[in-house]
């Protein structure tokens, strides 16, 4: 830590005196203190001398010596009083700027420590301090107003009793700034606007802040609009509102509107788009494919997006068949509004049954007319398989019927032994039927195909199996020839319950 000579915490001198303050450290040292006149600074290696041969009351202050190279940042200080009978105060600042709830130091330094007992803080022109002003005094630093409030932004003077009369300092202006968390808060309503040409419209831009010093304006396509401003103060916030009223809108009023507010912390802006249309409109769309395929027993949500102006006068979901005349339950239909002119309508179809395949239509109406959007829902089924032995044109034939959706593929297997299902070790022969005959293929129904396997002689210690598979699953049927005829055996696991 540097050492100051003279080694006293305080030094009291008279105006015109010579003052020499010497600081010595291990490394280079430097003096600092309030910028004031008449000081001369001399440095010589590890010592620095601060001197004046004509001290004035303005040299009153705390002078600190630091060692810049010291990692611990040690410093030493000495306080100099230049006691001028005509000047009890050395005011180091004309203005003090602090934020609310900070301590505000009004730096009027007493030039004579003897006067400390008779000091006080007043507002200019002798006015008393505001109620609840909590302050303290230090002869080295001045008056501190604790936890300063915005309302305490005033001009202050420091007062000292000298020979029975009060001597005032020059004034210090205190500016207590509100803590502004950021740029003003903004609202621009509506967030989006659509009007038919000739209708009326209103756009409201409002900004608020804890501090009155902020600007707000509304601009249309980058042109600032001249709109009278309404100002208000409530909930401890200043509010400025700009209202644009349009009695009869036309196409030139359309475009981007931006509400912009700025203060010392920066700028905020928010925008909206105003569309002017010739007539009412109603548009239906879906992000989904209008042709849907779902496995039986699973669920599906059908979603329709509606864009409309003016608003909808009616809407509903309708089942158009072909299986029954049931209609979707209202509780399964759901509507959500994305914004003023866009809505999403959802129809929930949980645990789909075979009779629920078919066409679903969403209908909506507004002054622009009716619109409809239709979905086609086809259910997927795993294959069901059956095999029979028959003679076709005198030849023994195994006939396999497979029913499912999508259309099943058919494979025949011949394996040794009697079994419900051929495994790899038993397989003797495999036949793929690339083109089974389609027996039925109606919209929204299962597809039924038939595959024929001509067998000249049925081997009695063997099993013939028809396997069908599609994207949903697979099914099989094992045919076991028996001396007394033939035996067909569906596998145990194929008990399909939707």
């Amino acid at each position: 830590i540097p050492v100051i000579e003279p080694s006293v915490p305080e030094l009291v001198v008279k105006p015109g005196a010579t003052v020499t303050l010497r600081c010595v450290g291990n490394g280079s040292v430097e003096w600092d203190g309030p910028p004031s006149p008449h000081w001369t600074l001399y440095s010589d290696g590890s010592s620095s001398i601060l001197s004046t041969n004509n001290a004035t009351f303005q040299n009153t202050g705390t002078y600190r010596c630091t060692e810049p190279g010291d990692p611990l940042g040690g410093s030493a200080a000495i306080h100099l009083y230049v006691k001028d009978p005509a000047r009890p105060w050395n005011v180091l600042a004309q203005e003090v700027v602090v934020f609310e709830d900070q301590d505000a130091l009004l730096p009027c330094l007493l030039t004579d420590p003897v006067l400390e007992a008779g000091v006080s803080l007043v507002r200019v022109r002798g006015r008393p301090l505001m109620r609840h002003t909590n302050y303290s005094f230090s002869p080295w630093h001045g008056f501190t107003i604790h936890r300063a409030k915005f309302i305490q932004s005033q001009d202050y003077q420091c007062s000292a009793l000298m020979g029975g009369r009060k001597v005032m300092s020059i004034s210090i202006r205190l500016k207590v700034q509100k803590v502004i968390p950021g740029p003003p808060a903004l609202t621009l309503v509506p967030a989006e606007l659509v009007r038919i040409r000739g209708e009326a419209a209103q756009i409201v831009c409002s900004a608020s802040s804890v501090d009155v010093n902020f600007d707000v304006f509304l601009q249309h396509n980058n042109t600032k609009l001249a709109i009278p401003q309404q100002s208000d103060f409530h909930n401890n916030r200043y509010q400025k509102v700009l209202t644009l009223n349009l009695d009869q809108v036309d196409f030139q009023h359309a475009g981007n509107y931006s509400c912009v507010a700025s203060n010392v912390q920066g700028k905020h802006s928010t925008s909206m788009f105003f569309r002017v249309v010739e007539s009412a409109y109603l548009n239906l769309s879906s992000e989904q494919n209008l042709i849907q395929e779902v496995t039986v027993g699973e669920g599906l949500n059908l979603k329709v997006m509606v864009e409309a102006y003016p608003g909808l006068q009616g809407f509903n979901w309708t089942y158009l068949g072909p299986f029954s005349d049931h209609q979707p339950e209202p509780k399964l239909a759901n509507a959500t509004t994305k914004d003023t002119y866009r809505h999403t309508f959802t129809l929930s179809l949980p645990r789909l049954k075979p009779s629920e395949a078919g066409r679903y239509s969403f209908l909506a109406r507004n002054p622009g007319g009716w619109r409809a959007l239709t979905f086609e829902l086809t259910l997927r089924y795993p294959p069901e398989v059956s095999v029979i032995w028959t003679f076709i044109n005198g030849s023994g034939t195994l006939l396999c019927a497979a029913s499912g959706y999508p259309q099943p593929n058919v494979t025949w297997l011949q394996c040794s032994g009697h079994t419900d299902r051929c495994d790899e070790a038993q397989v003797l022969q495999v036949w793929d039927d690339p083109y089974p005959e389609v027996l039925s293929q109606e919209p929204f129904h299962k597809v039924t195909v038939q595959s024929l396997l001509t067998v000249e002689t049925l081997e009695h210690n063997q099993t013939y199996e028809c396997r069908a598979h599609n994207s949903v699953g697979s099914g099989s049927w094992a045919f076991i020839p028996i001396s007394a005829g033939a035996h067909t055996h569906p596998p145990d696991e194929f008990l399909f319950t939707p």
């Epitope: 004031s36 000081w39 203005e95 003090v96 700027v97």
Partner: antibody
Framework: QVQLQESGPGLVKPSETLSLTCTVS????????WSWIRQPAGKGLEWIGR???????NYNPSLKSRVTMSVDTSKNQFSLKVSSVIAADTAIYYC??????????WGQGSLVTVSS | QSVLTQPPSASGTPGQRFTISCSGS????????VNWYQQLPGTAPKLLIY???QRPSGVPDRFSGSKSGTSASLASSGLQSEDEADYYC???????????FGGGTKLTVL
């Protein structure tokens, strides 16, 4: 080593407020006085004012009515605002450390142009 | 109009001695010390001399300063090409309660 860095908009419209911030690194803002000095193109230096960590300020009388300085010790920053700017306020603005009236550390300067 | 008066320009050849003057009044140079700042092209000013004649560390000893009455001067014993810069004098002004600067002297090394 103490370093100072000015930041703020380079272009300000007439009648608006010029705002600059000086960030101090390599040392604490708390123990010194800090100043703003400006230099119009091709001209000399002009002292704008000074501020102490406690918020105490002194301004050049010729600019006093338009200048506000503030300090944020938590961010090691001090700032300058000049209101109602005119073309004559176009200059390079420097922040500097003021030690007993000696400006021993300077920022690199920030050019502010006042123009519509 | 600057409070302190400096010649707008000065020139010299390498190795030559140069002097820049700075004139003030009793409220500034007459009662307070003078500081000098060097501003190399395109850079910020740098402290060159403080308290009339003190050099900060890193400043070559060819630079020196002096003060007499209400005037001060900056001198260099051997001009070098890197000395080409603007030089400003400054002093505390009692009336302003702040610093005042000279208008600057542009030094050209020929």
């Amino acid at each position: 080593q103490v370093q100072l860095q000015e930041s703020g908009p380079g272009l300000v419209k007439p009648s608006e407020t010029l705002s600059l911030t000086c960030t101090v690194s390599g040392g604490s803002i708390s123990s010194y006085y800090w100043s703003w000095i400006r230099q119009p193109a091709g001209k000399g230096l002009e002292w704008i004012g000074r501020i102490y960590a406690s918020g105490g300020t002194n301004y050049n009388p010729s600019l006093k009515s338009r200048v506000t300085m503030s300090v944020d010790t938590s961010k090691n920053q001090f700032s300058l605002k000049v209101s109602s700017v005119i073309a004559a306020d176009t200059a390079i603005y420097y922040c500097a450390r003021n030690r007993l009236g000696i400006y021993d550390y300077w920022g690199q300067g920030s050019l502010v142009t006042v123009s519509s | 109009q600057s409070v302190l008066t400096q010649p707008p320009s000065a020139s010299g050849t390498p190795g030559q001695r140069f002097t820049i003057s700075c004139s003030g009044s009793s409220s500034n140079i007459g009662s307070n010390t003078v500081n000098w700042y060097q501003q190399l092209p395109g850079t910020a000013p740098k402290l060159l001399i403080y308290s009339n004649n003190q050099r900060p560390s890193g400043v070559p000893d060819r630079f020196s300063g002096s003060k007499s009455g209400t005037s001060a001067s900056l001198a260099s014993s051997g001009l070098q090409s890197e000395d080409e810069a603007d030089y400003y004098c400054a002093a505390w002004d009692d009336r302003l309660n702040g610093p005042v600067f000279g208008g600057g002297t542009k030094l050209t090394v020929l």
